[in-house]
Each structure stands twice: as structure tokens, then as C-alpha cells.
Interface confidence: low
């Protein structure tokens, strides 16, 4: 049938951060090419990444249409140079991915401290509201827009001269904390979705310390 050198894809894996979503699989093709299809549980299959020799396919454009849906993808294997050829059952070989629900499973990207401002013994720390690839009315929504109150940020802060760190949380993108006058503090933030069972937390942001350029100081 001309498919003897065609093997089914395996290790299909979703890689998704802030809704940027890529399906990866193995093996690297030798005598074959791949096409990916994606659908919701109740929807039609849509083909992407036609006859590619890549072992990944960016499915972001599809999943951002409704990040609360559950998606299934499948990877078809075709003989290189003979993509009309099918397997022994009359269809090309394919393998299904695990199910993927972006809203519940996309990884939270590493947040960034946008700025901090000290006024007397208080410091206001602002977390950058990162833009996602989810769109509404032709504009890209921020992480806060998409997750609403499901998303919180945890602030870790400590005196420059000390190892003991304190924590604070916010349901917005700003923290207002009390500090000791004359002391320099360092800050790191983490995005958290407490209601999740998996991928609840992002990695910590880069550490920012007072006395560096992101800070403003007022008496």
C-alpha cells in the first residue's frame, strides 16, 4: 500500500503558556509528513500544519476562540511524496492527543514586576498585566481580563540585608506594603489560580530590589 515506512505519531503533548499553545509529538519524520487536526468535543475537525515535517504545531489561533472549551487534537502520518496514501484500514495513520482545556491547564507565564514606588513607609508594587493572545473585539485581552478574579498574585519581599521573607497577596495587580524606613527591600511575585488542581502557580518573577531603576522614591 506504500505505507510500510509510515509510523504513527506518539508522545503527543500540549505545551501552553498564557494560552500560547503548541502541540508537540514524536518521532522526527524520516519518510513521512504530518497533518494536525483539532476539534472541540462537539465540534468539527479543523486541519492545521498541513503535510509538515515539523514535530510541533501552533494551535493558539484555534484554542483562543474559546479558552473554556475542551479540545482534542490528532496527528496524521502520511508517506512523504504520496500524501494521498492511506493505511491498511483505508485511512492514514493517526494518534489522538490528551484532552486539553486551556482555561484550566495553560501554564501561567513568569510575571514581571512593572514598577515599585515608595512613599514614606509604604511601597506600592505593580505587576505587569501581561497581554495574552485571546481576543475580544479585535483587541488582545490581558491575563487579568481573561481570568478575572480567579487570578491572584503573591508578593514575596524581604530586606536586602536579610533572608527572612514576607508574603502578601492581591486580587488586582498592585500591592501596598509597609516597610521600614531607610531599609532596602527586594521583591518577587508569582501568579496563582487557587481554584485550579493543576498548574496553579507560575514561576517566580525576576527579583527586583529597591535602589534599582524600576523604583521611585518619595518622602
Amino acid at each position: 500500500s506504500g505505507t510500510t515506512n509510515t509510523v504513527a505519531a506518539y508522545n503527543l503533548t500540549w505545551k501552553s503558556t498564557n494560552f500560547k499553545t503548541i502541540l508537540e509529538w514524536e518521532p522526527k519524520p524520516v519518510n513521512q509528513v504530518y497533518t494536525v487536526q483539532i476539534s472541540t468535543k462537539s465540534g468539527d475537525w479543523k486541519s492545521k500544519c498541513f503535510y509538515t515535517t515539523d514535530t510541533e504545531c501552533d494551535l493558539t489561533d484555534e484554542i483562543v476562540k474559546d479558552v473554556k472549551q475542551t479540545y482534542l487534537a490528532r496527528v496524521f502520518s502520511y508517506p512523504a511524496g504520496n500524501v494521498e496514501s492511506t493505511g491498511s484500514a483505508g485511512e492514514p495513520l493517526y494518534e489522538n492527543s490528551p484532552e486539553f482545556t486551556p482555561y484550566l491547564e495553560t501554564n501561567l507565564g513568569q510575571p514581571t514586576i512593572q514598577s515599585f514606588e515608595q512613599v514614606g513607609t509604604k511601597v506600592n508594587v505593580t505587576v505587569e498585566d501581561e497581554r495574552t493572545l485571546v481576543r475580544r473585539n479585535n483587541t488582545f485581552l490581558s491575563l487579568r481580563d481573561v481570568f478575572g478574579k480567579d487570578l491572584i498574585y503573591t508578593l514575596y519581599y524581604w530586606k536586602d540585608s536579610s533572608t527572612g521573607r514576607k508574603t502578601n497577596t492581591t486580587h488586582t495587580n498592585e500591592f501596598l506594603i509597609d516597610v521600614d524606613k531607610g531599609e532596602n527591600y527586594c521583591f518577587s511575585v508569582q501568579a496563582v489560580i487557587p481554584s485550579r488542581t493543576v498548574n496553579r502557580k507560575s514561576t517566580d518573577s525576576p527579583v527586583e530590589c529597591m535602589g534599582q531603576e524600576k523604583g521611585e522614591f518619595r518622602e
Epitope: V64, D145, V146, K149, S195
Partner: antibody
């Protein structure tokens, strides 16, 4: 449809604790909404006191935070407000409301779509 | 705290006229979090508009909302007798959630 009903004493003495309960009928308190308390001083505007999610997580108005506790009892489909150390300035109509996250086209909208009728609380000795 | 300033404080109009109510925020508010309410004496507020421009269920189409960032507007295209009331804007995006001071629409 969902209805809310506030209940509690209409008269509270200064320095005591004001306690109100909001009973949710026609729907489950655990259905994914937030539940708020708002008050309105006589002849004045509206002031948000705080809110609770059915899981128990709360947010409070910082101006009242040191005196406010909001709790939820999912088994009774109720949530409650306690405001300690009351003064005459706490005399108001107290409303409970449902703060609905409405998911549409990739993101959330929030609004208070269901309100109780309100209960008048007077702080006086 | 986000301060919402409503203007005018009072609007005196006749039935059939157009009412334009303004709500200005002290800092930018995502339209997802901006709502308008109507309140009549002795009653609880009633949701009119959410998401700055979407009408709530059962609200007549003479009510419309617009705006973004710091400037929002509620428009009543033709006032009906039942529309004379106090109108509040509200933001539910940043704690503490805040209401404007209200605009009273009264019969001229």
C-alpha cells in the same frame, strides 16, 4: 430565579456587633458567583463593604476591613455580615447582592445583577 | 481607590427628552468591570448596563452605555415617566469596588 433576602436586628447599640444574614433562594450559593454586602447611608450613595466566594475567600473594603467579617454557610445557602464596634455612622440600609462573573468572548464581565430588598439598621442606644 | 465622579448631580428633564449621564474614573477602568444601576426611592438598585455597553436582561433599548478608560456615559434616548430615578455607575475591578455619587434624573 435567584432571590436574596436580608435578615437581622434593625437596632444595634453603639460598640456592639451588627450581624446580618442573606439567604439565597432559587439557586445555589455554590454556583460560581461572588456574594457582596453593600450599604447606603440615609440620603446618600452606595458603599461596597465586601464580598465572599462560596469557597470562603473574601475581599473587604479597606476602610472597613478591621471591623468586617463575611462568612458563608453553603449548607444553609446563606452568607453573613458581621460589623464590630458600630457607631451611629454605621446606620444605613444594608443590601446583599450577587456579583456575577459573566464569561463572554474570551473574558469576564462582572456586575451585581441580583439584589436583596435591603434591611435598615439603626445604631442607637 | 478608584473614585467615580458622576455629573451632573441632578438632571431636570421632561418625558420624551434625551438624558446623558457622565461617569469619570480617577484612573483607567476596564470596561469589563463598569456597570450602571437605577435606583428608585425605597428600592434596591437595579442593574441596567454591564461591561460599559451591554444591556442587562429585560432593560429597554432606550438605555445605552458607552465609553472606555476613564470616561463612561449612560444615555436614555427618550425618557419615560418610570425612568425618573437616581443612576449610579460602579466599578468592580479594583478593590474597593466603588460607586459614583449618583445622578438624579427628575421631572422638569
Amino acid at each position: 430565579q435567584v432571590q436574596l433576602q436580608e435578615s437581622g436586628p434593625g437596632l444595634v447599640k453603639p460598640s456592639q456587633t451588627l450581624s446580618l444574614t442573606c439567604t439565597v433562594s432559587g439557586g445555589s450559593i455554590s454556583s460560581g458567583q461572588y456574594w457582596s454586602w453593600i450599604r447606603q447611608h440615609p440620603g446618600k450613595g452606595l458603599e461596597w463593604i465586601g464580598e465572599i466566594y462560596y469557597s470562603g475567600s473574601t475581599r473587604y473594603n479597606p476602610s472597613l476591613k478591621s471591623r468586617v467579617t463575611i462568612s458563608v454557610d453553603t449548607s444553609k445557602n446563606q452568607f453573613s455580615l458581621k460589623l464590630s464596634s458600630v457607631t451611629a455612622a454605621d446606620t444605613a440600609v444594608y443590601y446583599c447582592a450577587r456579583d456575577t462573573p459573566y464569561y463572554y468572548d474570551g473574558g469576564y464581565y462582572y456586575y451585581m445583577d441580583v439584589w436583596g430588598k435591603g434591611t435598615t439598621v439603626t445604631v442607637s442606644s | 481607590e478608584i473614585v467615580l465622579t458622576q455629573s451632573p448631580g441632578t438632571l431636570s428633564l421632561s418625558p420624551g427628552e434625551r438624558a446623558t449621564l457622565s461617569c469619570r474614573a480617577s484612573q483607567s477602568v476596564s470596561s469589563s468591570y463598569l456597570a450602571w444601576y437605577q435606583q428608585k426611592p425605597g428600592q434596591a438598585p437595579r442593574l441596567l448596563i454591564y461591561g460599559a455597553s451591554s444591556r442587562a436582561t429585560g432593560i429597554p433599548d432606550r438605555f445605552s452605555g458607552s465609553g472606555s478608560g476613564t470616561d463612561f456615559t449612560l444615555t436614555i434616548s427618550r425618557l419615560e415617566p418610570e425612568d425618573f430615578a437616581v443612576y449610579y455607575c460602579q466599578q468592580v475591578g479594583v478593590v474597593p469596588y466603588t460607586f459614583g455619587g449618583g445622578t438624579k434624573v427628575e421631572i422638569k
